[in-house]
Interface confidence: low
C-alpha cells in the first residue's frame, strides 16, 4: 500500500495523483525538501522547532486515503481531472428520521467550485453500517435514493420540493463505503451561485416490509466524530495549460501549503519529516475543501 510505504519509495513512484507536480525537482529528495520548507517557515516564526499540539491534529477522511491508495496503485482508475476536492457533511445536528421501514438522513454541503473549472465527475460517498445478527449469513438488501432538497418557491415552509439525483440498490454484507454519482447536480450547483446545498438520503426495505431484527438493518454513518462522515468528492479540470499548471503548482507549494499547516496540526512535523509528515502534507492537498490536486 503506497500510504504505508511513503518513506520507502520515491515520490514520483508513489504519487500517481501528482504525476508531474514535482517533475522540476527531479533528483531532490522530498524529505529534504520538506525539511527545508519547515526550517524556512520556522525561521519566519522565530522558532527552532514546532510546538506539539496534539489536539489540533486533523485526520483526513478514511475514504480520501483509500482514494489516494487506489489512484497511486492503479493509474487507469483516475478520472481525467486535475483537481480533486472533498466536502464533508456539515449537518451535525439533524437526526435520521425513521417510519414504516423508511429512514431519512439529511445532509448539508457547502460546495464551492470556481466557474472556470469543468466538473468532470462528482461522487457522494456514504459509509453504510450493516447491523445484523451474526448467525444470519444473508446480507441486507435495501433501496436507496438520494434527493436534492430544492429551495421552496411557495409560502408554505412545510412543502419541500425534492429532486431525485440517484436511485439504486445496496446489498450489504459488511459495513463499507458506497459511491453515488451526482455529477449533474454538482454541475448545476456550480452554475447556481449558491454554495449551501441540502441532500436527503432515503433507505427503504427492498421488499416493502418494515425492518426487523431478522432481516438486519442498514444505516448511513453520519456521525461527525469519525472518519466515516458522508463526503462529496468533486473531480474537476481547470482547463489551464500545462505551463500554467506548473507555475501555479510551484506557487501553491511555496505559498499555499505552509500557511495551512495549522489546519493539519503542527505536531505532525514534530517527529521529523517522516511518514506521518508526508501523509499529513499530502492529505492536505487531497483533502482540504479548497486544496487542489494536480496531475
Amino acid at each position: 500500500s503506497p500510504i504505508m510505504n511513503l518513506e520507502q519509495s520515491p515520490l514520483e513512484e508513489d504519487m500517481s495523483l501528482f504525476g508531474d507536480v514535482f517533475s522540476e525537482q527531479d533528483g531532490v529528495d522530498f524529505n529534504t525538501l520538506l525539511q527545508s520548507m519547515k526550517d524556512e517557515f520556522l525561521k519566519t516564526l522565530n522558532l527552532s522547532d514546532i510546538p506539539t499540539q496534539d489536539s489540533a491534529k486533523v485526520d483526513p477522511p478514511e475514504y480520501m486515503l483509500e482514494l489516494y491508495n487506489k489512484f497511486a496503485t492503479d493509474r487507469t482508475s483516475m478520472p481525467s481531472a486535475n483537481i480533486i476536492r472533498s466536502f464533508k457533511n456539515e449537518d451535525l445536528f439533524s437526526q435520521p428520521v425513521s417510519f414504516n421501514g423508511l429512514r431519512k438522513y439529511p445532509l448539508l454541503f457547502n460546495v464551492s467550485i470556481p466557474h472556470h473549472e469543468e466538473v468532470i465527475m462528482a461522487e457522494l460517498r456514504l459509509y453504510t453500517l450493516v447491523q445484523r445478527d451474526r448467525m444470519i449469513y444473508d446480507g441486507v438488501d435495501r433501496k436507496i435514493t438520494i434527493f436534492e432538497v430544492l429551495e421552496s418557491k411557495g409560502d408554505n415552509e412545510g412543502e419541500r420540493n425534492m429532486l431525485v439525483l440517484v436511485s439504486g440498490e445496496i446489498y450489504g454484507t459488511n459495513s463499507e463505503w458506497e459511491t453515488f454519482d451526482v455529477t449533474d447536480a454538482i454541475r448545476r450547483w456550480q452554475k447556481s451561485g449558491s454554495s449551501t446545498h441540502q441532500l436527503e438520503v432515503h433507505i427503504e426495505s427492498k421488499h416493502d416490509e418494515a425492518e426487523d431484527a431478522s432481516s438486519g438493518r442498514l444505516e448511513i454513518d453520519t456521525s461527525a466524530q469519525n472518519k466515516h462522515n458522508p463526503l462529496l468528492i468533486v473531480f474537476s479540470d481547470d482547463q489551464s495549460s500545462d505551463k500554467e499548471r506548473k507555475e501555479e503548482l510551484n506557487e501553491m507549494i511555496s505559498h499555499e501549503q505552509l500557511p495551512e499547516l495549522d489546519n493539519l496540526g503542527l505536531d505532525s512535523f514534530s517527529s521529523g519529516p517522516g511518514e506521518e509528515a508526508l501523509l499529513q502534507m499530502r492529505s492536505n492537498i487531497i483533502y482540504d475543501s479548497t486544496a487542489r490536486i494536480r496531475r
Epitope: P79, I120, M121, G168, E169
Partner: antibody
Framework: SLEESGGRLVTPGTALTVTCTVS????????MSWVRQAPGEGLEWIGS?????ITWYASWAKGRFTISKTSTTVDLRISSPTTEDTATYFC??????????????WGQGTPVTVSS | DIVMTQTPASVEAAVGGTVTINCQAS??????LAWYQQKPGQPPKLLIY???KLESGVPSRFKGSGSGTQFTLTINDLECDDAATYYC??????????????FGGGTEVVVK
C-alpha cells in the same frame, strides 16, 4: 460522433468483434454502451463500460459478449454467435447516472448477419 | 430482472391529434426513465430523460410524465414527421441491477 464498423456475415460459432470509433468524445469521461436491434424488432441493451473501465451486461448477455475500450474505440466481442444474434449493432454514449445512463448520442449502427 | 412493458404496440392518429404511450416498470425506477424516437433505417433519438425533462431541440409537443412504475409519453398536435416507433428506457440502479432489457418493446405511431 460515433461510427460502428466490423459488422459482416459470419457463420455460427465464429467469434466476431464490432468496433465503435469515437471522435470529439473523451472516453475517459463517458459511459459507452452497445444496443442491438434485430430486423423488425425492438431495441435490446447488451452492456456498458464506464470511465473506470467497469463493464456490466444484460442478464442474457453475460458470458456471450465482452465490451472493452481504448482511448478512441469501444469494442464488442461476440464469442460464439448464433443466428439469433443477427441484428444491427448500435454504439451509444450514455449520460452517466450511477453506473447507468440514458443515451444522448448514437452511431448509425453496423449490421451483423449470422448464417450457415 | 427489471422488465419494461410498453403499451400499446401500435397506435394510429390523425394530424393535429394526440397520442398517449404508456410504459410500466416491473419495479419502481423512481424518475429514471427516458423516451426515444426511432425512424426506419435510423438510430434512436433521445426525446425525454428524467421522466419529464425535454432534451434540447425537442419540440414541447412531446411531454413525459409519471414516476415509480407508471410512465406516459404524450405527443400533442401530431405532425406527419412524428410517425415513428417510440421506446421507453429505464436507467435505474447501478452495477448490481439486473436487466433483461431496460428498453420497452416499442410503440409504433402511425399518422393519418
Amino acid at each position: 460522433s460515433l461510427e460502428e464498423s466490423g459488422g459482416r456475415l459470419v457463420t455460427p460459432g465464429t467469434a466476431l468483434t464490432v468496433t465503435c470509433t469515437v471522435s470529439g468524445i473523451d472516453l475517459s469521461r463517458n459511459l459507452m454502451s452497445w444496443v442491438r436491434q434485430a430486423p423488425g424488432e425492438g431495441l435490446e441493451w447488451i452492456g456498458s463500460i464506464n470511465f473506470r473501465n467497469i463493464t456490466w451486461y444484460a442478464s442474457w448477455a453475460k458470458g456471450r459478449f465482452t465490451i472493452s475500450k481504448t482511448s478512441t474505440t469501444v469494442d464488442l466481442r461476440i464469442s460464439s454467435p448464433t443466428t439469433e444474434d443477427t441484428a444491427t449493432y448500435f454504439c451509444a454514449r450514455g449520460v452517466y447516472v450511477n453506473s447507468n445512463g440514458y443515451y444522448s448520442l448514437w452511431g448509425q449502427g453496423t449490421p451483423v448477419t449470422v448464417s450457415s | 430482472d427489471i422488465v419494461m412493458t410498453q403499451t400499446p404496440a401500435s397506435v394510429e392518429a390523425a394530424v393535429g391529434g394526440t397520442v398517449t404511450i404508456n410504459c410500466q416498470a416491473s419495479q419502481s425506477v423512481s424518475n429514471l426513465l427516458a423516451w426515444y424516437q426511432q425512424k426506419p433505417g435510423q438510430p434512436p433519438k433521445l426525446l425525454i430523460y428524467g421522466a419529464s425533462k425535454l432534451e434540447s431541440g425537442v419540440p414541447s409537443r412531446f411531454k413525459g410524465s409519471g414516476s415509480g412504475t407508471q410512465f406516459t409519453l404524450t405527443i400533442n398536435d401530431l405532425e406527419c414527421d412524428d410517425a415513428a416507433t417510440y421506446y421507453c428506457q429505464t436507467y435505474w440502479g447501478g452495477d448490481g441491477t439486473s436487466y433483461l432489457n431496460p428498453f420497452g418493446g416499442g410503440t409504433e405511431v402511425v399518422v393519418k
